[in-house]
């Protein structure tokens, strides 16, 4: 019998009282087969967190800070359920830290230093701990002890607290520092009063502090938000302009064995029975004998944190980068201008050779980071162990929804101003055999499907688009008799024409042989009775342009396009029957690398792109015999985006919108992860 | 963004023509699909014709518009066209112009469609 109990820790007395209701009442409520509580007692949230992973106990609630030593080794814990607020149509899970300005002030972030600042307190998360943190590298040193690196950064500040007999430039703005209400310039409503009193330049607080303190929009329309990429923005698009995103109180479990569905079982049972006005006897989110016991008082109920999720995705890039800074205290040498080397996310074995091979070319410019698949290399990216990648239009958008942007586009056709001029498209074609000849768009159900992969556009968005358009359910493996459609689940039908073996079978990478454009033309030579590919893929692998032995007798001739009217068409008449005209790949990255990115990616091309003639000789980096590594084959030159800078832009408005409503038949759990960060 | 605006329709006899255009701004690159949809009183709207901007290719959704009805465009101006020749008063409705940037011709569903038109009213009299 699975033990079903979960062993909660509380760090005070109070805490183990309630926790002992807590576990009294769930048992009157729930059957005896079902989620149970036993309380374990700490000195700490640090004892709580390494009991956890001795698996002395199994759950603990922490706020952002807790959250972080939490994930670090040797504890390895991950967020499992979050506590929310607000209401249940708009939870409110993240709350956003922000820097205020008044509008006329007319510097950016990176102007900071030799203005003065208002804090909501020394140590806290808003007002103190992540813009210190984001800052940190550009403090005088030496930054220890931190608070007089602070205090000669800016020219004053009131950092309530904070000791202003030894750093009186921290009080200056709040004589004597008072470290509660008594301070008119203490916590978030202090700190922006600080701001609005014109005592300082900029506020460090939370998002919603200036809507709580201004409640006329005319009011609010004199403040600015500071943007770590040098703009300003209104104060309501504090979702774009912030410095990190933090989560409110989140319950930790251990990543293996960490029984986190029981977690969520138990609290989700106990959230519809003793949450927010349920029961007079027991509730869950109120202390009589304290303050924010085991939970926040103010919390409304709880979410289940998606599993694709560790701490460093659900804390955000910056919120780490914030607190990794003020931990370790590590800055490179000296700051400078020079771009550091461009960290590369390679999928697998293949693109690792290739990425290698453009490294040690690049003279250091380019590094290599593994991933096994596309997710997880925007995962990489979005933590920083990576830097960017070339995607297609599928994974562009689920990057995007992760809050990484498009810099540069991939270009397939030959023009005189290639690196200007990014294209409308690529076309999204259905391919069969000529002999099949009875095969329509309309008679596709019960056939053999070959598809790039899951996610992607050509090969999966666009026809599953149009496919669940018809037959509004997302039962794909039911409509096709079988297929290789690779990232999708192992025991699926839409798995089973595939060719890796063992464990790289329906792989979404090269491993597995009937991945991408080539391997699902492949799929469809060997075995299935349509291919969901580029109009570019089938002329790419017939008349002996493919070399290998499956390619290399195929003619181009006896393939045809399904075109969405009915009819079918030679090949090369792709403009005239295509499903879709699809966005090229594009490079993705963090908004922090954007402008590093660009400048080393436009030499890289003009020294390794499309102008080297001798491929056999040299590094190439649009070349890999068909198997599009790290690029397409068939790219030209990488094009300026101009305006189309954000995934919502650059893939375009239908496009978004086809890919959201194939969102009700997502398996990415990547994306369900960014969603729970940015609904 | 892309804005599309129709003009033409009006009132006429059965047997009698009428020509609707269809003037679309604001795209750049690549060729698109642009169709003509009607909606009869009390109906959901039906697709009738469809053009491949970047190719000149045309679409009938059937054979009763075919012969009567024809769909061309002038890319100089932008603009998309529908004869409709030999009206019956069963081709009254309101007539919508659309065009996706993303799907091919050929699909007559309206959700893919993108962009959509005010509409011109079409009334055919016996």
């Known amino acids: 019998v699975p033990d079903k109990t979960v062993r909660w820790c509380a760090v005070s007395e109070h805490e183990a009282t309630k926790c002992q209701s807590f576990r009294d009442h769930m048992k009157s409520v729930i059957p005896s087969d079902g989620p149970s509580v036993a309380c374990v007692k700490k000195a700490s949230y640090l004892d709580c967190i390494r009991a956890i992973a001795a698996n002395e106990a199994d759950a603990v609630t922490l706020d952002a800070g807790l959250v972080y030593d939490a994930y670090l080794a040797p504890n390895n814990l991950k967020p499992v359920v979050a506590e929310f607020y607000g209401s249940k149509e708009d939870p409110q899970t993240f709350y956003y830290a922000v820097a205020v300005v008044k509008k006329d002030s007319g510097f950016q972030m990176n102007q900071l230093r030799g203005k003065k600042s208002c804090h909501t307190g020394l140590g806290r998360s808003a007002g103190w701990n992540i813009p210190i943190g984001l800052l940190y590298c550009d403090l005088p040193e030496p930054r220890k002890p931190l608070e007089k690196a602070v205090a000669n950064f800016f020219s004053g500040s009131c950092a309530p607290c904070a000791d202003g007999t030894d750093f009186p430039q921290l009080c200056q703005l709040c004589p004597g520092c008072g470290c509660s209400t008594l301070n008119q310039y203490f916590g978030y409503s202090g700190a922006f009063k600080c701001l609005k009193d014109g005592a300082g330049d900029v506020a460090f607080v939370k998002h919603s502090t200036i809507f709580e303190n201004l409640a006329n929009k005319a009011d609010r329309d004199q403040y600015e938000l500071l943007c770590l990429d040098n703009t300003r923005k209104p104060v309501d698009e504090y979702k774009d302009c912030h410095l990190a995103q933090v989560p409110s109180h989140t319950v930790v479990a251990r990543s293996m064995g960490g029984k986190e569905d029981l977690i969520w079982e138990l609290l989700n049972q106990a959230q519809e029975h003793f949450g927010k006005d349920k029961s007079k006897e027991f509730q869950l989110f109120s202390s009589p004998h304290g303050k924010d016991l085991l939970f926040k008082d103010s919390a409304h109920g709880f979410l289940k944190v998606p599993p694709r999720m560790d701490a460093k995705m659900y804390l955000g890039y910056e919120y780490v980068t914030a607190i990794r800074n003020l931990r370790e205290g590590t800055c490179p040498e000296a700051p400078t201008d020079e771009c550091k080397p461009v960290k590369w996310c390679a999928l697998s074995h293949h693109e690792r050779l290739k990425c290698d091979e453009w490294s040690v070319n690049s003279v250091g410019k380019i590094e290599c980071v593994s991933a096994e698949t596309t997710e997880d290399c925007i995962a990489k990216i979005m933590n920083g162990e990576a830097d960017a990648m070339s995607l297609d239009g599928g994974f562009v958008y689920i990057a995007g929804k992760c809050g990484l942007v498009p810099v540069l586009a991939e270009n397939y056709n030959k023009s005189d101003n290639c690196e200007d001029t990014p294209e409308a498209g690529y076309f999204a074609i259905a391919v069969v055999k000529k002999s099949a000849s009875d095969l329509t768009w309309d008679n596709l159900k019960g056939k053999k499907s070959c598809h790039t992969a899951v996610g992607r556009t050509a090969g999966w968005n666009i026809p599953m688009g149009l496919l669940y358009n018809k037959i509004n359910h997302c039962r794909f493996d039911e409509f096709f008799s079988e297929g290789c459609a690779p990232g999708s689940k192992k025991d699926s039908s839409l798995c089973k024409l595939c060719m890796g073996s063992g464990l790289n079978l329906c792989e979404p990478n090269n491993k597995e042989g009937y991945y991408g454009y080539t391997g699902a033309f492949r799929c469809l030579v060997e075995k299935g009775d349509v291919a969901f590919v580029k109009h570019q893929t089938v002329p790419q692998n017939t008349g002996g342009k493919n070399p290998d032995p499956w390619a290399k007798n195929l003619n181009e001739k006896d393939y045809e396009l399904l075109c969405l009217d009915g009819t079918r068409k030679p090949v090369e008449e792709y403009a005239n029957c295509h499903l879709a005209r699809a966005p090229n790949h594009a490079v993705v990255t963090r908004k922090d690398k954007e402008a590093c990115v660009h400048k080393i990616l436009r030499q890289q091309q003009h020294l390794f792109g499309s102008n080297v003639t001798d491929c056999s000789g040299n590094f190439c980096l649009f070349r890999s015999e068909t198997k599009d590594l790290l690029f397409r084959d068939d790219t030209v030159c990488l094009a300026k985006l101009h305006d189309r800078n954000t995934y919502e832009k650059y893939l375009g408005e239908e496009y978004v919108k086809a890919v959201g409503n194939l969102r009700k038949c997502s398996t990415s759990s990547l994306l369900e992860a960014c969603t729970f960060r940015r609904p | 963004d892309v804005q599309l605006v129709e003009s033409g329709g009006g009132s006429v006899q059965a047997g009698g023509s009428l020509r609707l255009s269809c003037q679309a701004s604001?795209?750049?690159?690549?060729?698109?699909?642009m169709a003509w949809f009607r909606q009869a009183p009390g109906k959901d709207r039906e697709g009738i014709a469809a053009?491949?901007?970047?190719?000149?290719?045309?679409?009938y959704a059937d054979e009763s518009v075919k012969g009567r009805f024809i769909i061309s465009q002038d890319n100089a101006r932008s603009t998309v066209y529908l004869q409709m020749d030999s009206l019956k008063p069963e081709d009254t409705g309101m007539y919508y112009c659309?065009?996706?940037?993303?799907?091919?011709?050929?699909?007559?569903?309206?959700?893919?469609?993108?962009?959509w038109g005010q509409g011109t009213q079409v009334t055919v009299s016996s």
């Open positions: 659309a065009a996706t940037l993303l799907y091919g011709c050929g699909a007559w569903s309206p959700r893919l469609f993108g962009y």
């Open positions: 604001g795209y750049t690159g690549g060729g698109h699909c």
């Open positions: 053009i491949y901007t970047g190719t000149g290719s045309t679409y």
